[in-house]
Interface confidence: medium
């Protein structure tokens, strides 16, 4: 699996989407887990409703929510009030029995550019106001890892 990067702003919410084949994963519950180290286990954070037919109902664990569009084939995870410690490698999983298939590997990055909170009226930089008109809107962006980028830096 390639790793997809999702970037969110500290203090705001981040939505992570994991598309999948709805027929292949029919009847399966889903889960969101956090990878502990490069070769460590994936620790369950939250999973969809125990009854698969109710997978569309949002389930929370702390500040993390999960909901599953089983017809459209999209698992959505929301990380609310994103904090620096939320950064790291995660997985979207499809569960069957005691096994779990990886739907997507996700690297969550928490961004914090200090210019993002400036009000346009307070600007001391010329010609920048267009960057601030949506400063408090919840944003997310996803991309694949650049060649040479690694989700886990080598430990010293």
């Amino acid at each position: 699996h390639n790793t997809t990067v999702f970037q969110g702003v500290a203090g705001q919410s981040l939505q992570v989407s994991c598309p999948y084949d709805s027929m292949k994963h029919w009847g399966r519950r889903k889960a969101w887990c956090r990878q502990l180290g490069e070769k460590g286990p994936c620790q369950r954070v939250v999973s969809t409703h125990n009854l698969w037919l109710l997978s569309f109902l949002r389930r929370w664990n702390g500040s993390t929510a999960i909901t599953d569009d089983t017809l459209g084939g999209t698992l959505t995870i929301t990380l609310r009030n994103l904090q620096p410690h939320d950064a790291g490698l995660y997985q979207c999983q499809s569960l069957h029995g005691s096994e779990a298939d990886t739907l997507r590997k996700v690297l969550v990055e928490v961004l914090a550019d200090p210019l993002d909170h400036r009000d346009a009226g307070d600007l001391w930089f010329p010609g920048e106001s267009e960057s601030f008109e949506d400063a408090h809107v919840e944003h997310s962006i996803s991309r694949s890892l650049l060649e040479g980028e690694i989700p886990f830096p080598p430990t010293s």
């Epitope: 500290a10 620096p84 914090a112 550019d113 200090p114 909170h117 944003h139």
Partner: antibody
Framework: EVQLVETGGSLVQPGKSLRLTCATS????????LHWVRQSPEKHPEWVAH??????????YYAESVKGRFTISRDDSKSSVFLQMNSLKEEDTAIYYC??????WGQGTLVTVSS | DTVLTQAPLSVSVTPGESASISCRSN???????????LYWFLQKPGKSPQLLIY???NLASGVPDRFSGSGSETDFTLKISEVETEDVGVYYC?????????FGPGTKLELQ
């Protein structure tokens, strides 16, 4: 005129505490995110801590090297930001700058931790 | 952490000549809304750092236009087109994309 004036730096022994104060004027303090950045002699600046505005619930962030030992806080009514430094180590020796990490920087206050 | 490296660490320039300083990041600094959170500072001897360039290529208020910034997601350049005596000091690149914020080791610019 924008001013940031840091005070409270001194010579202290390892394990002791120190409280730095940054008094500001000349800009809309309550809206500005503020930081402490330190710089050891002949070294590059190192970000230490960050406090957001009231609208962001005064959220705080810390460098790993000071987490659990340093506390950043602010008093909007006095346009001041503080850095409470506990369990000081020799490697905390540096000039400490109060800054918005962009255009506003104080002149710095020297903290020396030595036995 | 995001690690920034700079080259050269020291540069000696004749007034009126141009100078270039390179900064490289071990991670992409391209963030939301295609903003690249790479900043350049100049620290003159005995002074606090002062902002020169914000978000890779934008000139901060009051900074002479002989300074310019460019780059990609991980490789950045600060160029001074005609160095003047007041440009002496240490130039730092910094990333403010993700915590912890980090600064490069600095490039000392001296006059020949």
């Amino acid at each position: 005129e924008v001013q940031l004036v840091e005070t409270g730096g001194s010579l202290v022994q390892p394990g002791k505490s120190l409280r730095l104060t940054c008094a500001t004027s000349g800009f809309p303090f309550s809206n500005v995110w503020l930081h402490w950045v330190r710089q050891s002699p002949e070294k590059h600046p190192e970000w230490v801590a960050h406090i957001k505005a009231k609208s962001d619930n005064y959220a705080t962030y810390y460098a790993e090297s000071v987490k659990g030992r340093f506390t950043i806080s602010r008093d909007d009514s006095k346009s001041s930001v503080f850095l409470q430094m506990n369990s000081l180590k020799e490697e905390d020796t540096a000039i400490y700058y109060c800054t918005d990490i962009l255009e506003y920087w104080g002149q710095g206050t020297l903290v020396t931790v030595s036995s | 952490d995001t690690v920034l490296t700079q080259a050269p660490l020291s540069v000696s320039v004749t007034p009126g000549e141009s100078a270039s300083i390179s900064c490289r990041s071990n991670k992409s600094l391209l963030g939301i809304r295609d903003i690249t959170s790479l900043y350049w500072f100049l620290q003159k001897p005995g002074k606090s750092p002062q902002l020169l360039i914000y978000r890779m290529s934008n000139l901060a208020s009051g900074v002479p236009d002989r300074f310019s910034g460019s780059g990609s997601e991980t490789d950045f350049t600060l160029k001074i087109s005609e160095v003047e005596t007041e440009d002496v000091g240490v130039y730092y690149c910094a990333q403010f994309l993700r915590y912890p914020y980090t600064f490069g080791p600095g490039t000392k610019l001296e006059l020949q």
